[in-house]
Amino acid sequence: DYKDDDDKGWVWNQFFVPEEMNTTSHHVGRLRSDLDNGNNSFQYKLLGAGAGSTFIIDERTGDIYAIEKLDREERSLYILRAQVIDITTGRAVEPESEFVIKVSDINDNEPKFLDEPYEAIVPEMSPEGTLVIQVTATDADDPASGNNARLLYSLLQGQPYFSIEPTTGVIRISSKMDRELQDEYWVIIQAKDMIGLPGALSGTTSVLIKLSDVNDNKPIFKERLYRLTVSESAPTGTSIGRIMAYDNDIGENAEMDYSIEDDSQTFDIITNNETQEGIVILKKKVDFEHQNHYLIRANVKNRHVAEHLMEYHVEASTTFVRVQVEDEDEPPVFLLPYYLFEILEESPHGSFVGMVSATDPDQRKSPIRYSITRSKVFSIDDNGTIITTNPLDREISAWYNLSITATEKYNVQQISAVPVYVQVLNINDHAPEFSEYYDSYVCENAGSGQVIQTISAVDRDESVEDHHFYFNLSVEDTKNSSFIIIDNEDNTAVILTNRTGFSLQEEPVFYISVLIADNGIPSLTSTNTLTIHICDCDDYGSTQTCRDKDLLLSMGFRTEVILAILISIMIIFGFIFLILGLKQRRKPTLFPEKGEDFRENIFRYDDEGGGEEDTEAFDIVQLRSSTIMRERKTRKTAAAEIRSLYRQSLQVGPDSAIFRKFILEKLEEANTDPCAPPFDSLQTYAFEGTGSLAGSLSSLGSAVSDQDENYDYLNELGPRFKRLACMFGSAMQSNN
């Protein structure tokens, strides 16, 4: 209460208004001035926030009323000002004064869980007393006002697994829980104010308590026996089936590893990390005929087990897996991965080479048929016996690589092949011969015993030991006694003069027959002609000038030949233009006897067998139109080239450099002459006939010299060869 010192002034109380009053208005209190004598001349005024809206004053009496429901939780204090005015004068009777209206609390707010939804995770099998979560409710009422905001927590749902501390809201585990039985629990918590006394308000919340997994379950196979099948044809690494163990745990705790307790040589088990299945893998190929089923024992263990949980994983779960091997119709199997046979060259037709053997690995043991892929030299019978069908020449082919196939009689799809290597063994069937062509020169004034040539020999036969050649002169040349031979016994010999003085006019050339014998059994001897030119030497006795002159002569001759070829080409061109001109007029057929396009089949015979297949037709007319002729070589040059190529062919085949040169020449022809034939394929003629019994069909192999070649016989072949006869006839005339 307040009163002025001079006993005059305001009189009031500090006012309290209960919140949430349901009446239209609530009397707060009365402002009163003790100067008010009740004469109805004082007017009371209320000022400040809430005056006239929340609080109204009866201006006659000073009674203050709250006309709105108040909420302490919204506003707990109002500070207002009061005035008292004498209405007769309109002046304030007393100074304006401030007073307080406090809103007193009632228990009108229930406890609220502001942090909901609550969710907690706790490991399964946690011991009693383990803290799960703390829940907290908030009561908006005045904590200082009695028990309005004093809370007690209790569990409405969740016993007997959980308990709550009444004053703190701490939830604890009260009994062990197994996630595999139930993995989550809804716990309902009630918070009551007024410390639970009558008239208390309450609020509830739900707590979702999830049990996290611990590895308290081992994986267990659902089946005692799994039946799987595998084809005997399955390659290693094949997945042949799946086995499955079940683990009631989840996540990492359910990860498992499978293993095989026995026979881990043939099978393996890997874990599919996605599905946790065990995939049985074939580690080694199986053979139905060898073993048609397997019984293996598999076990499964968890991958991650903590030390304190080992008690749950004492014994690993095991199961049996029966793997049935499925029989497959397998191709025949040769007894050996390859065969190596030897046979003497020149063995007659039908000679035994060797025998191969294949069997059907299947139970039914089908009979086997054998065949040789593309061979005209060997054949094989149903027993696997290989024989020759043609004589063999080691010098043509020292080795044969055959592919022999074995086919099941009742299922020709089942086929196997084996490589067979036939080595042709040497017999001494080739006499030694000069290793090169020798042109020797001797001065007219040469003295006796002068070395004029060192000679060496080659033998196409294979030598088990080193070849040894014996050199001698023929009986006639020995009698002649102009020259003698000395065997150096190192497979070379020297030719020496056996007299003094020679005459260029009387006898310009000597032809010496040199006999060369090998050390084979039986020994073979060849006669080789050595040409010795008599030379008009200089004072120093040098044959060089003689050799140079010969070289110039030969060059001169070559120039003549080239000129002759050029003239021939010009004649041919003239002839072609004449024909084209005639064609323009009357369009005659090329061959009046038969009007169709004429093509020649050029056969290649240096390949063993398959000659019938190498038939490619070439348009002769197109071939004739070549305007650039290759440089003609003399007999000896060409022969030497062919010999060198022939030697190479015995080793690896035609030298690629030779063909590169040939192709480049052809490209040059094509670039120079737009009328050159299309260069679509390459036919190799350098080796023509070398593999056949008949020998070479080429005129290059002829013993006749270039100058002696006569092509008149072409005229006798009829109209088809008329142009060819004309071409070669003209060329020969030009040369002559």
Epitope: G38, N39, N40, S41, F42, D58, E59, R60, Y65, I67
Partner: antibody, heavy 122, light 108 residues
Framework: QVQLQESGPGLVKPSETLSLTCTVS????????WSWIRQPPGKGLEWIGY???????NYNPSLKSRVTISVDTSKNQFSLKLSSVTAADTALYYC????????????????WGQGTMVTVSS | DIVLTQSPGTLSLSPGERATLSCRAS???????LAWYQQKPGQAPRLLIS???SRATGIPDRFSGSGSGTDFTLTISRLEPEDFAVYYC?????????FGQGTRLEMK
């Protein structure tokens, strides 16, 4: 224009409580002072008390112990309760309005109801 | 309480005449808070004058009030037939509000 209409039982037994209601129509009950006045048969007028719309009241000291005046702003009504009535309380009861709007002092009654006769008799 | 005494108790006059009604207070009425009412039989009182001299809305100007302190007068300058009724004075200067016992104005 504002009109007042009294209602209530015309007969009340002695010692019982007389209850009357005055309904304000044509205007709001807010911001005015509302009084009850009675007139015994053949006699003069007697002021019973007033109520302000906020609920503030002032009663005639001669009746204060037995009188309660209340207001229901939602219905635009105010009421009179007179307890422990006797035959002396038989009268014509009027409701009336102070003429001054939110006056700080009292004023004459500018609007009256037609009055309702209440007889106290057993 | 302030006691109001009205005189005469009954006044008999003819229409057209002047009527003067008196009201005396047992103590001074603060602020001249005195009102005059007219009541006809079977009707509620009707406010004529407030604040001792202020005519209420719709009241003919033949009605006038005067006085202060303790003595107050209501004058009807020229009586009309409808003016014959009972007239009450009321003070509202001090609680409780009190009324006079009334003056009956009757036609002679």
């Amino acid at each position: 224009q504002v009109q007042l209409q009294e209602s209530g039982p015309g007969l009340v037994k002695p010692s019982e409580t007389l209850s009357l209601t005055c309904t304000v129509s044509g205007g709001s009950i807010n911001s005015y002072y509302w009084s009850w006045i009675r007139q015994p048969p053949g006699k003069g007028l007697e002021w019973i008390g007033y109520i302000y719309y906020i609920g503030s009241t002032n009663y005639n000291p001669s009746l204060k112990s037995r009188v309660t005046i209340s207001v229901d702003t939602s219905k635009n009504q105010f009421s009179l309760k007179l307890s422990s009535v006797t035959a002396a309380d038989t009268a014509l009861y009027y409701c009336a309005r102070d003429s001054r709007y939110r006056s700080g002092w009292y004023d004459a009654f500018d609007i009256w109801g037609q009055g309702t006769m209440v007889t106290v008799s057993s | 309480d302030i006691v109001l005494t009205q005189s005469p108790g009954t006044l008999s006059l003819s229409p057209g005449e002047r009527a003067t009604l008196s009201c005396r207070a047992s103590q001074s009425v603060a602020g001249s808070y005195l009102a005059w009412y007219q009541q006809k039989p079977g009707q509620a009182p009707r406010l004529l004058i407030s604040g001792a001299s202020s005519r209420a809305t719709g009241i003919p100007d033949r009605f006038s009030g005067s006085g202060s302190g303790t003595d107050f007068t209501l004058t009807i300058s020229r009586l009309e037939p409808e003016d014959f009724a009972v007239y009450y004075c009321q003070q509202y200067g001090k609680s409780p509000i009190t009324f006079g016992q009334g003056t009956r104005l009757e036609m002679k």
